[in-house]
């Protein structure tokens, strides 16, 4: 039995997969910040986690997925104040009793040191210094991401 948040996450992910392929993104859109091979949009308003998830989807993006500790630190360096929390694309899967990214993968326990409980209706937020488990109904800011397409040198056959 999936929770409403899990269903919402799966539905949005599936609808994104059904959309037609778009040409790769070479530059970040206006208001988006480039961080390595990603474009990030830090919201100025607040929402519960599932509304944040939906908002990113409407922007043809996803809630932030963090690959490793290094990416976490670089993202946190972009947060201007210690009293701002941002939702990312990670929440507790009740059915699998584990932290699950919105792309379907599970959290590697070494990647993030989460402060707080792993339980139903818990979603993950980040601040300037830490990673927190908060109730998914809490209204805080959120971070959307778009992947930049790496530019590859074209190799032409000898003429």
């Amino acid at each position: 039995q999936k929770s409403s948040i899990e269903k919402c996450s799966v539905d949005i992910q599936q609808s994104r997969n059904k959309t037609t392929e778009r040409p790769g993104l070479l530059n970040c859109p206006i208001y988006w910040q480039q961080l390595r091979e990603k474009c990030l949009l830090f919201s100025h308003t607040v929402n519960p986690w599932n509304n944040s998830l939906a908002d990113c989807s409407t922007k043809e993006s996803s809630l932030l997925l963090i690959r490793d500790k290094d990416e976490l630190i670089h993202t946190q360096n972009l947060i201007r104040d210690k009293a701002i929390l941002f939702w990312i694309g990670l929440n507790f899967s009740l059915s699998e009793k584990n932290w699950k990214w919105i792309n379907g993968s599970f959290l590697n326990s070494n990647d993030l040191e989460i402060r707080g409980d792993a339980k139903e209706n818990s979603c993950i937020s980040i601040s300037q210094t830490s990673v927190y488990s908060e109730y998914c109904s809490t209204e805080i800011r959120w971070i959307c991401q778009k992947e930049l397409t790496p530019v590859r040198n074209k190799v032409y056959p000898d003429s």
Epitope: H44, V46, R80, D81, K82, A83, I84, L85, R115, G116, D117, S127, S130, Y132, S133, E134, Y135, S137, T138, E139, I140
Partner: antibody, heavy 119, light 107 residues
Framework: EVQLVESGGGLVQPGGSLRLSCAAS????????MSWVRQAPGKGLEWVSA????????YYADSAKGRFTISRDNSKNTLYLQMNSLRAEDTAVYYC????????????WGQGTLVTVSS | DIQMTQSPSSLSASVGDRVTITCRAS??????LNWYQQEPGKAPKLLIY???SLQSGVPSRFSGSGSGTDFTLTISSLQPEDFATYYC?????????FGQGTKVEIK
């Protein structure tokens, strides 16, 4: 109806300790950051401390750092402020308020509890 | 820390008057500015958040404007229950700071 009710104030000697409580009702307490704000007699408002909905994240005004500790018990819908090493300048009405993480405004306030630090 | 400066510190007005209170931040705070009303012996009450949004249940005679460093609270037609002290507050960065207050008294 949202209600915040503070208690625990009183007269304490300099260097003493006091624990304030704020009982919350009428909303999902665990989903909101909470703050303490104080007002010295005849003076303006001063933010003291805030805590996230889960209680995992806290922060303080410089005047409270190292002496005051904010905490919460979500199972009891209660916010706390443990105040140690109290000084005369801590004399004030202490309010608990809903909100405290940027960009929250304080949309609901308790009636306040008076803390008097005097020998 | 961001300093918030209100003016005037106090003013005298009559019922029906249009009253304007200003608040200046020591640096840009975008629109992260709130206004509160405090009657004597009572807790503050939120009037305006995000510089210009009226809090639910607050009469429409109250309005807010401004962004960056300069903000204004306007009471279009002062009522007897509006005689109180008004505070601005920034929620742009920590520590959260308030203006020193503006006391609105009966002329």
């Amino acid at each position: 109806e949202v209600q915040l009710v503070e208690s625990g104030g009183g007269l304490v000697q300099p260097g003493g300790s006091l624990r304030l409580s704020c009982a919350a009702s009428g909303f999902t307490f665990s989903s909101y950051a909470m703050s303490w704000v104080r007002q010295a007699p005849g003076k303006g408002l001063e933010w003291v401390s805030a805590i996230s909905g889960s209680g995992g994240s806290t922060y303080y005004a410089d005047s409270a750092k190292g002496r005051f500790t904010i905490s919460r018990d979500n199972s009891k819908n209660t916010l706390y402020l443990q105040m140690n090493s109290l000084r005369a300048e801590d004399t004030a009405v202490y309010y608990c308020a809903r909100g405290g993480y940027l960009p929250d405004a304080f949309d609901y306030w308790g009636q306040g509890t008076l803390v008097t630090v005097s020998s | 820390d961001i300093q918030m400066t209100q003016s005037p510190s106090s003013l005298s007005a009559s019922v029906g008057d249009r009253v304007t209170i200003t608040c200046r931040a020591s640096q840009s705070i975008s629109s992260y500015l709130n206004w509160y009303q405090q009657e004597p012996g009572k807790a503050p009450k939120l009037l305006i958040y995000a510089a210009s949004s009226l809090q639910s249940g607050v009469p429409s005679r109250f309005s807010g404007s401004g962004s960056g460093t300069d903000f204004t609270l306007t009471i279009s037609s002062l009522q007897p229950e509006d005689f109180a002290t008004y505070y601005c507050q920034q929620t742009y960065s920590t520590p959260l700071t308030f203006g020193q207050g503006t006391k609105v008294e009966i002329k």
